[in-house]
């Protein structure tokens, strides 16, 4: 058995997390899991879902009662998601911690807008997807 | 030339970021987005950096003199990132759109934590990962 | 000041057992992945093993797999290294190393070593 | 399988620069963080480098890390060379896929 199965089953006492009713009005996140099966979409809805968890953790980085209930399901997910690649994780954390609201920040996120648009798709790299049209209408 | 890029070039100019100055103590996501060459570790960044990006957005909405380039931006990031996919897009919000604080949406997040680490790391479906021990001792 | 201190080596016959010690001082224990590192004489530093912080997952270098076993007890702030089966080629100085807190961290703090000779 | 390989052998003479170079092979250097150990002779291996660049409080600013992901190595540069810094200098990173801890083969540097 992995090692956060015991510890997330801690968190669900802490948290009042059992009882079946709070399963209603749908989940959160693993309808939106079953939707997706390919791989890179999986990455783009996991990598949500993980920066989630780690904003939850955060806020109950002090309570003792669950803090090594906390670090052990951390440390499970850093080596299930980011396959304990520490600059995997870093990396991801920075782009967690950005500040929207901070001024330099936006600066440098419109400066480096073009080239990040330019390397969104698979395409960019592997010229296989074929654009007949640019139809968005969301 | 793709749509984005003459109204990301009105955007510098509305934000002033296209002083070299900007570039000052390295990029936000360029430096990161190198790292990176694998798909599925490329869509766990763009992931991230889509958010930010989306948020920002969000903060300028009712900004009349930038609003349409804001909106083909995003149009493009629609076509390129979600593959004018909109069930992948809205799914994609929905996830960034969860409050931490609020109590319902923690304990539904603690409720699924299982099911979503059993689905975290590739290993999970294709049974490549090798875990020398699980030597779990509470 | 972190201190890792091993213990526990020494002569063994080939096919026999020894098991080795680190005792860890000056950090949260629990936090830190653990590894082991050896170096036969007179050559280049070699992974033999690493745990998580927890003592939840271990991994292996290859040549050890099998007959080796790292363990870890975070309430008494000691990592451990079980090493059975022993060959001539396993003879090294044996070095406990303390990790971040992801395994695929650096090394960042080392303790003197250990010998082991594994002879007949 | 990662692998790293480094020179066997580099000497250079006092208060000049040298580079060790550390090259990967089997995968891209650039994913997983890159550290460097001093080992001077009978004694255990000490961190110069961590995290592809980052030096250790107490290590002087003489040493250096890098990253060059176009030809998939890492370098550590000392500059002003002194006799303290005659020692094996080891580079060492991580591979995801199996999770093992990567050493490279040593140098052995010398100040002449």
């Known amino acids: 058995q992995d090692p956060y199965v015991k510890e997330a089953e801690n968190l669900k006492k802490y948290f009042n997390a059992g009882h079946s009713d709070v399963a209603d009005n749908g989940t959160l996140f693993l309808g939106i899991l079953k939707n997706w099966k390919e791989e890179s979409d999986r990455k783009i809805m996991q990598s949500q879902i993980v920066s989630f968890y780690f904003k939850l953790f955060k806020n109950f980085k002090d309570d003792q009662s669950i803090q090594k209930s906390v670090e052990t399901i951390k440390e499970d997910m850093n080596v299930k998601f980011f396959n304990s690649n520490k600059k995997k994780r870093d990396d991801f954390e920075k782009l967690t911690n950005y500040s929207v609201t901070d001024l330099n920040v936006q600066r440098k996120a419109i400066h480096e807008l073009i080239q990040v648009m330019a390397e969104l798709s698979p395409a960019a790299k592997t010229g296989k997807r074929k654009r007949s049209q640019m139809l968005f209408r969301g | 030339q793709d749509p984005y890029v003459k109204e990301a070039e009105n955007l510098k100019k509305y934000f002033n970021a296209g002083h070299s100055d900007v570039a000052d103590n390295g990029t936000l996501f360029l430096g990161i987005l190198k790292n990176w060459k694998e798909e599925s570790d490329r869509k766990i960044m763009q992931s991230q950096i889509v958010s930010f990006y989306f948020k920002l957005f969000k903060n300028f909405k009712d900004d009349q003199s930038i609003q349409k380039s804001v909106e083909t931006i995003k149009e493009d990031m629609n076509v390129k990132f979600f593959n004018s996919n909109k069930k992948k897009r809205d799914d994609f919000e929905k996830l960034t759109n969860y409050s931490v604080t609020d109590l319902n949406v923690q304990r539904k997040a603690i409720h699924e934590l299982i099911q979503v680490m059993a689905e975290l790391s590739p290993a999970a479906k294709t049974g490549k990962r090798k875990r020398s021990q699980m030597l779990f001792r509470g | 000041e972190v201190q890792l201190l091993e213990s526990g080596g020494g002569l063994v016959q080939p096919g026999g057992s020894l098991k080795l010690s680190c005792a860890a001082s000056?950090?949260?224990?629990?936090?830190?992945?653990m590894s082991w590192v050896r170096q036969a004489p007179g050559k280049g530093l070699e992974w033999v093993s690493t745990?998580?912080?927890?003592?939840?997952?271990?991994y292996y270098a290859d040549s050890v797999e099998g007959r080796f076993s790292i363990s870890r007890d975070n309430s008494k702030n000691t990592l451990y290294l079980q090493m059975n089966s022993l060959r001539a080629e396993d003879t090294a100085v044996y070095y406990c190393?303390?990790?971040?807190?992801?395994?695929?961290?650096?090394?960042?703090?080392w303790g003197q070593g250990t010998l082991v000779t594994v002879s007949s | 399988n990662f692998m790293l390989t480094q020179p066997h052998s580099l000497s250079e003479s006092p208060g000049k620069t040298v580079t060790i170079s550390c090259t990967g092979s089997?995968?891209?250097?650039?994913?997983?963080?890159v550290q460097w150990y001093q080992q001077r002779p009978g004694s255990a291996p000490t961190t110069v480098i961590h995290?592809?660049?980052?030096?250790p409080s107490g290590v002087p600013d003489r040493f250096s890390g890098s990253i060059d992901g176009s030809s998939n190595s890492a370098s550590l540069t000392i500059s002003g060379l002194q006799p303290e810094d005659e020692a094996d200098y080891y580079c060492?990173?991580?591979?995801?896929?199996?999770?093992?801890?990567?050493f490279g083969g040593g140098t052995k540097l010398t100040v002449l």
């Open positions: 190393a303390k990790g971040t807190e992801l395994v695929g961290g650096g090394l960042d703090n």
């Open positions: 000056g950090f949260t224990f629990s936090s830190n992945a």
């Open positions: 745990l998580t912080g927890s003592g939840g997952t271990a």
């Open positions: 089997g995968g891209s250097i650039a994913t997983n963080y």
């Open positions: 995290e592809d660049n980052q030096r």
């Open positions: 060492q990173s991580y591979d995801s896929d199996n999770h093992h801890v990567v």
